[in-house]
Structures are given as C-alpha cells and as structure tokens.
Interface confidence: medium
C-alpha cells in the first residue's frame, strides 16, 4: 500500500501520527500554548495522499496560528472597553455598568491561552424581572429582552463561532433559567483541566448526594438530589476505540474511566457500571445487567481486558450505536424491573462519552439521546435520573455542536468538554469527584480540590483545650467521639473546663464543644519509669472524649476512618471476612510509609513511618538523647512497641501543640488514621508566636529530629473496650 | 557578644599542609555547627564543609574530601581545619563561619590568608 | 550539587535608586515550609556579613531598607534606596542539603 508524503511540518510546530505514514493514519497537529495549529489535522487516504478534513485544497501549509477570543458583540446598559475586533492571548476587557444598574460577574476579564475568557459573564442587572437577567456571553447575541416567568431568550454565535450550552432558555417558577449559560468559543478552543474538573466534579457530585460547592445561598438556585447510600446509579462509560485514536491515547481513555471506576466506588453509593467500546460497532464489555456490574474489581478488569485490537476491521466512528447500545440496556432493565416499579424508576443514570471525534457514520447520536430521555420518562421533575457527560479530547476533529447537543444542559452546571489532550483528560479524571460532601458519618473523606480549605481536606482534625494551658489536637473518629493523648491531660481529670473545637461550614473559627467524658488510658504514667533514669515515658499515651452533643456532618466536619473497622473495610474496600491484621497489612505496608499529620496552621504535613529494621535504626537515635534519658541502656525501655517512628529524611516533625492529632494515610481516595502524635525530640516551632512558622532542626541538632506516634494497631484492645458500641470492630 | 577569631596568615609550599584555628566565644560552643568557606583573591565564596562540635560529625564539599579536616577542641572551645596536599590554586582567605539555627552563616571569623608558593 | 546563579555580575545604581539582584537555583531550595536561601554583604578586606536569611528575613541589625523575596528556584535580594555604604559584593547561599552552594556574587557600585 502506498505511504502518505513526509514533507508535512508545522512551523513552529511538531506534529505525531496515530499509524506512521501508512493510509488510516492521522496526522495531529500541535503548537505552543498560546498558537493553535491551521490545520488541525489530516488523514492519509488510502490513495497515499493526505486530506485535510474541511478543507478545499488538498494540501494547504500548516502554520501555527495566534489564538484570539472573542469580542463582545453586544452588551447592555453599559460599556466595555477596549473595543476590539477579537483580543488577543493575556488581553484584557473591562465592562462598567450605565446608573441604577449593578454589575453581576466578571468586571475584567482576560484572554487565556486555550481560547477562552476567564472569569464569568459581566452583565448590568437593575433586578426588575422575575428572573435575574441572563445575559450575553461574549461573542454571542441575544434576542429576547423580557424576564418574566415563562419568557423566553435566544442565543446565536456571531461569525464562525460556536455556540455550546442552551441556544434556548426559558425563565422558571422558581427564578432560575432553564439549560445552562451558552458561550461563544472560537472551533479551535479547549478547555483546561482545571476548569473541568471542578465543572464536571460539581455536576456529578450532585448525583452522588452532594450540593454543589459554588452555589449561592438562595436556596431554590441549582439542583439539589440525594442519592441516599440506599439508592442506585447506573454509570456507563462509552469509549471511542475509532481509527482516529491512537494506541496509546486509548491506554489513556481507558487509565482514566479506572480513575473514574474508584472514584464512583469509594462513594459507598450502591453504582453498576457499563463499560462500552466503539468504533464503526459497539462492544459492550460490561453490562449494568451483569452482577459484576456492582463489583469495583470485576469492572476494573473488564476495563483492562478493553482491546485496542477488538476494533480494527471497523474503525469509524459510529457514536449513535454506541449511545444506543445504552439504551438497549435500559430496555432490558426496565423490562427486568418493571416500568412502574420503584426499583427502576429510583435508578439515576449518569452516561460519560469519550470521544475524539465526530460520528461519521450510524445516524444522528441525538436520536438515541431522545430515546433514552423517553424510555427514561425524563422531564422537568425527572430531569435529575439522567446526565450525559460528552467529553471530546484531542481539539482535531471534535465537532462543538455536536458534543454540546449530546450533553445535558442543567442550569450552574456543564456536560460538554473539550480537552486539549488525552493526558488532560487523566488530570480531570484524578481530581473530578470530591465525596466530601455528603452529609451521613462515612469516614476518612477528605476535599482533596486544589482550592479547598485545610478543614476541608482533614474534616476530623478538631482542636482540645484544655483549661488555658497549651492546646493539643485530635480526630473525630465518630459523630460523638474524639481521640488523642493522654498526656494533654495530666492535670487531673476535671473536665468542665476543657472546649473541643470541631470544623463548622459556618465559622472559619470552628464550633465548640463540652465534654461529656472523657476516657484517659490507665496505664498512662510519664514518670513510670523515673527510677530507671527514664524521666518521661509515654507508653500508652492514648484518651478519648466523648463531646457533650452529636457533631452535625458537614464538609467541614467528619470522621476519620479507623483501621480494624467494618467502617473502614468498606472503605478500603476489602472483602468480608477480612481481619484487623489485614488492615495492618495493607496499610502499614512498606519499610517506609508515607503519612501525614496536621500542622498548628491546619495544613497537612508529611512524613514517613518507619516500619521492620527501618524502625529499629529510627528509634535508636533516642539513646543519644542525653537530658530526657541520661542512663538509658536499651531503647526499648522508652520507645516500645506500641509506638511508630517518624523524624528521618525530609519528615516533618510534629510541634508541641500538635499532640493527640492524627498520623493519617490515604488510600483509594480515602483515610485512614494508623497512629496519634505523642511526643519527640524536636519541637520545630519552639520560640515562634507564629502559627505558619516552624523550621526544621538545625544541622548542628544532636540527636537529629525522631518522633514517636502511638499504633493503633497495638491499642485494639483498650479501643475495643471504649467503643465497641460506637464502631464495628473487625476480628484482629 | 558572639566573637570567632581565627590564627594568622600561612605561608606554605606545595605539597604541604595547613591547620587554621578558629576560637569561639559568646556562646555555648557545642550548640552551634562551625563551617569553613574559602575565597581565592577577586573570586567568590566557596564552602569547604562543617563540624557539629558535640558530636564531632563532619560534612564534607566533595571537592575537599580526603585533603580537608575538621577538628574540634571543646575544651577550649576552638575549630580546626587542615588542608593538606596544597596547591597554588589553594591561595585563598580561609574563613570559618557559625551556622544559626536556620543554617546560615551569621557570625564569621576575620579570615587567614593562607599562600601556595614554591 | 544545587548551583547557583546571581544577575547580573555587577551592576551601577544611582544613589537613592532601587537595586534589584537575583539569584536562580538549579534545584528547589524549599523544605519544610521554608526557602533556605540566604543573602550575604561583602566588602573588600571584610568577611561576609549575613543580610537576610531564610529568602525573605531581615537579620536583627540590617537596615530595612534591604529585603528578600522568592521561593522554590528564583530570589531577589532588594535594596529599596541606595545609600554610599550599600556598595558591595553580594552572595546568595543555600542550605538545603549538603553541599552548601553560593553563587557566583553581584558587585554593586554606585553610579
């Protein structure tokens, strides 16, 4: 077979090849941010030529292009300034409002690199409508200047660009628009992935009984569905396996619906999930009808079995038989459960489609979107049981419109994406879903977004005080209880005087609360060993308190998960009949286990546990610690077996204020608490009055940093004891 | 006041060694590690490696290893540093150096001139 | 090793004139929260003197007219209205691991 010509670089470009030179190869383009390719791509033909998709000549010189964005075309009771023709990357535009009209959004927004304005649409609202005025993104116009309940605004995109979001949008009841905010963007614009990750996390964690994080305090504004851990998702994930997609990038698209796969999983929602790849035909490889459907490791490996080979004698891209293969199952489920029944109508249904390209064959994907809709009976009040995510990848020859109407429209929320590259996607993936939300007692969730609060990533941090001495800290490892260490209180046992103070959504400064009781291990003496030359000693430095109230749940306030826990076995998900040595294993795993505590500032801090030898050669710089341990004779004697051993390499230390706090580890997206900061031989933040300010030992330090955390796992039986009624314990 | 005088000039041939003292006063000598830095006439400044004087443990710049040593007296509160197969290209003030607790360099001796010539 | 490179090599400021001096480093300087990146003035026949340590604090002593900003890879070291005695070499040094590395020095003279 012919190979297509070599002579096709991009000045200022570099270009790669899904199949080398050989016919069905396509040829993609790329430039530096800030420049888009012209073309975007082109396919060797079977005739040993390339063809540039939409073009008219069949071979025009590819140039990277300066990426502009689009100017305003109108704007109302107002002005915006500059007033340009398209602005260019890092160009600002400013908008200010006419008298007796207030600014709602972005005042001054900036050309970014992929395309696209940053910040939200400027508009001059005076309040007047039973809706708020909706607007004109930029590039955009509108007809339709009545806000009324009922009425009824249009948009369209000026010159070549396109419209994605709600060419049409209607003015609700409840003061809120219909669809979702249409935007302008130029065809060969992107979206970042940090802009999609909390767009498309926003979205899908509403599904998963969650509210949306940037939602305004009216009630009534966005949607607001619990999926109760009771009710049931059926997720599908549709993967385009065309010619178009390389081996390599269908690797990526497969990586990143796993991510997706332990993401949905870790939110112990009741999901099934389908698993469909398409080219020219649809292969299902998991069905929502299939038990395995609901069994996390099934659906992983049934991912991993996904052939890039199983699609090669048909390699077009046939995106209506795929969305309807969807919709054969549906059927089949519905006819299963019964139309009228609960059980089929409770399912929520969430289709996420990675695709490269447009369907260029099969009919319009559309027609197997309204046969979903319709068997799914999805209307105003319906409209929560269905979502469909439509995310293009790779800016080539993914068609705006095409993915926009296949998404859903939902107002504050959006469904079509376009992502530069495969490897973007893999970014979304990774930080999308954030079950930190929900409201009941599941453990260990953490916000892990980039633009969340310290309480927000560690819910279960809370902070003692008792009487006015110095405060130390702990972990909610229920709604009522918290653990810590003993040593916080060895002034006696009144606790009327102690405050724990737990996160709260409402008050950066947190809620109090009294104690109801508190539980101080007995075997706790610092000065037990006094008469061996051991001047403090913190075997069993382990407490817990009972808070006076119940901690209302919040994304600011949850347990960790304790190991040995059925609590945290599902979490980890391990099967049934697993034991608290399993636990051990599985997470106290490695000479060297990276663990985190939370710093006086809030922020999590790292550091390694040592385990085996490692934690022998760790606590053995204890004996050069001359003043605490004047005659020691053998480590043991002060740094037992109940304690885990951190200080070495670039650990942090823990601070004196820091005591009781949790040593954590993350696994699966969740946490797990292994040990509480007792004590050591460094205090980093000894003479700072500052909270952000602690520095690590000095060189000439002798001995170097340790600290000693106490195991949960060698306190089984005390935290048995205590709360048994409170957890469910595993056998050890 | 923290105060850290070093002994006189050397001249030395090459192939010979070099011992430069720095005593130490105004403070608890064995709390701080002593550094030794170099600067040859018209260059820049060149760190040799330092001391922890309580437990004598030393960090070497590997340019030095093997020819430089760090010594420490704590009974008179003193730090040493011998250089020995010198070389003209070792023409250079020799300077030691107390860290902080931030390990910078905040107080510094007056430097000895040691010389490299045949 | 973490080298270090300060620009420019010299440079000539008028009397009450700002001088900005920078210092680019090989590898990441940060740990446990801090830059430890530290500022020193030299004058000729005179040791160093430590100006600023740990990127951005000003040593007890040291006019407030010097200052230090930066973090990770890329510091400066400000002189916010020169006076006739701020005429010097300046060394930035690290020391967030071993070897300790300066850089190459900026000298300053007034124009």
């Known amino acids: 077979a012919p190979s297509c010509p070599q002579n096709v670089n991009i000045s200022g470009g570099t270009f790669t090849l899904s199949h080398g030179w050989a016919p069905g190869s396509l040829l993609t383009y790329s430039c530096p941010q800030g420049l888009y390719p012209s073309p975007a791509s082109r396919l060797c033909k079977s005739s040993g030529q390339w063809q540039t998709p939409g073009a008219t000549r069949s071979l025009s010189k590819a140039v990277c292009k300066p990426v502009r964005c689009p100017a305003p075309v109108s704007f109302e009771n107002g002005i915006y300034t500059p007033r340009l023709g398209s602005y260019p990357v890092g160009g600002n535009v400013s908008f200010e409002c006419e008298d007796g009209f207030i600014l709602r959004g972005s005042p001054v927004r900036q050309c970014r690199p992929n395309g696209m304005w940053d910040g939200e649409t400027a508009v001059c609202d005076n309040g007047a409508g039973h809706c708020p005025n909706p607007g004109i993104s930029l590039g955009a116009v509108r007809t339709g200047f009545r806000f009324g309940h009922g009425d009824k605004v249009r948009y369209r995109c000026s010159s070549n660009l396109v419209l994605t979001g709600s060419s049409e949008r209607e003015c609700q009841g409840n003061g809120v628009w219909s669809g979702t905010e249409p935007i302008c963007r130029q065809p060969y614009s992107y979206d970042f992935p940090e802009d999609v990750a909390p767009a498309l996390g926003t979205s899908f964690s509403h599904m998963l009984g969650a509210t949306n994080p940037t939602q305004k305090t009216k009630e009534s504004l966005g949607r607001k569905i619990q999926i109760q851990r009771s009710g049931h998702l059926n997720l599908y994930l549709l993967l385009d396996c065309s010619q178009s997609v390389s081996e390599n990038d269908f690797l990526i698209f497969k990586e990143s619906a796993s991510l997706m796969v332990d993401r949905i999983f870790s939110f112990e929602i009741n999901v099934s999930v389908a698993i469909i790849t398409f080219a020219s035909e649809p292969k299902v490889l998991m069905s929502v009808l299939n038990d395995n459907s609901r069994d996390m490791t099934e659906v992983i490996s049934s991912l991993e079995n996904a052939n890039y080979k199983d699609h090669e004698n048909g390699t077009g891209t046939n995106t209506y038989a795929a969305l309807n293969s969807v919709y054969l199952m549906m059927n089949n489920q519905m006819r299963l459960l019964g139309m009228e029944t609960m059980a089929w109508q409770e399912i929520r249904h969430a289709i996420i489609l990675l695709t490269d390209g447009k369907s260029n064959m099969g009919g319009s994907p559309k027609t197997a979107v309204d046969h979903i809709r319709e068997i799914l009976n999805i209307n105003q009040k319906r409209n929560d049981y269905l979502d469909i995510y439509a995310i293009g990848v790779g800016k080539l020859d993914v068609d705006w419109r095409e993915l926009n109407e296949l998404g859903s429209k939902k107002d504050g929320e959006r469904h079509a994406f376009i992502l530069q590259d495969t490897k973007a996607l893999h970014q979304v993936f990774e930080h999308m879903l954030d079950v930190s939300k929900l409201t009941d007692t599941i453990c260990g969730v953490g916000n892990m977004s980039a633009n969340a609060s310290d309480q927000e990533r560690t819910p279960w941090h809370v902070t003692i005080k008792p009487k006015s001495q110095e405060t130390c800290r702990g972990a909610l490892i229920s709604d009522q209880w918290v653990l810590t260490a003993a040593h916080c209180f060895r002034d006696g046992n009144d606790h009327s005087l102690w405050r724990v103070n737990v996160g709260d959504p409402k008050s950066q400064w947190g809620k109090e609360f009294l104690i109801e009781k508190a539980v101080i291990s007995p075997g706790f003496d610092v000065f037990a060993k006094k008469n061996q030359g051991i001047l403090e000693f913190y075997g069993d430095d382990i407490a817990l308190l009972k808070l006076a109230q119940k901690v209302k749940m919040s994304t600011h306030a949850r347990p960790i998960c304790l190991p040995c826990t059925m609590e945290a076995n599902l979490a980890l998900r391990r099967p049934q009949g697993s034991t608290c040595r399993d636990h051990e294993n599985e997470l106290l795993n490695k000479q060297s286990v990276p663990a985190h505590f939370v710093a006086l500032n809030g922020s999590k801090l790292n550091i390694n546990l040592k385990m085996g030898v490692e934690w022998t050669s760790c606590a053995e710089v204890v004996s050069q610690e001359k003043t605490m341990f004047p005659n020691l004779t053998d480590v043991r004697e002060v740094v037992t077996d109940q304690f885990l051993c951190s200080g070495t390499q670039e650990d942090e230390s823990p601070c004196k204020g820091e005591s009781g706090g949790a040593v954590f580890l993350e696994r699966r997206f969740r946490f797990f608490q292994v040990g509480l900061v007792s004590w050591g031989l460094y205090n980093p933040c000894l003479g700072s009055a500052d909270k952000n300010s602690r520095k690590r030992a000095p060189r000439s330090k002798v001995p170097p940093p340790r600290d000693f955390h106490i195991n949960l796992f060698r306190m089984q039986p005390w935290l048995r004891q205590h709360l048994g009624d409170v957890l469910n314990f595993l056998p050890l | 006041e923290v105060q850290l005088v070093q002994s006189g000039a050397e001249v030395k041939k090459p192939g010979a060694s070099v011992k430069v003292s720095c005593k130490a006063s105004g403070y608890t000598f064995t709390d701080y590690n002593m550094d030794w830095v170099r600067q040859a006439t018209g260059q820049g400044l060149e760190w040799i490696g330092d001391i922890n004087p309580n437990y004598e443990s030393t960090g070497y710049n590997q340019k030095f290893k093997g020819r430089a040593t760090m010594t420490v007296n704590k009974s008179i509160s003193t730090a040493y540093m011998e250089l020995s197969s010198l070389r003209s290209e070792d023409t250079a003030v020799y300077y030691c150096?107390?860290?902080?607790?931030?390990?910078?360099?905040?107080?510094w001796g007056q430097g000895t001139l040691v010389t490299v010539s045949s | 090793d973490n080298v270090l490179t300060q620009s420019p090599d010299s440079l000539a400021v008028s009397l009450g004139e700002r001088a900005t001096i920078s210092c680019r480093a090989s590898k990441s300087v940060r740990t446990s929260g801090y830059n430890y990146m530290h500022w020193y003035q030299q004058k000729p026949g005179q040791p160093p003197k430590l100006l600023i340590y740990?990127?951005?604090n000003l040593k007890s002593g040291v006019p407030d007219r010097f200052s230090g900003s930066g973090s990770g890879t890329d510091f400066t070291l400000t002189i916010s209205s020169l006076q006739a005695e701020d005429a010097a070499t300046y060394y930035c040094?690290?020391?967030?691991?071993?070897?300790?590395?300066f850089g190459q020095g900026t000298k300053l003279e007034i124009k």
């Open positions: 740990l990127a951005s």
């Open positions: 040094q690290h020391s967030r691991e071993l070897p300790y590395t």
């Open positions: 150096a107390r860290e902080d607790d931030h390990d910078a360099f905040a107080y």
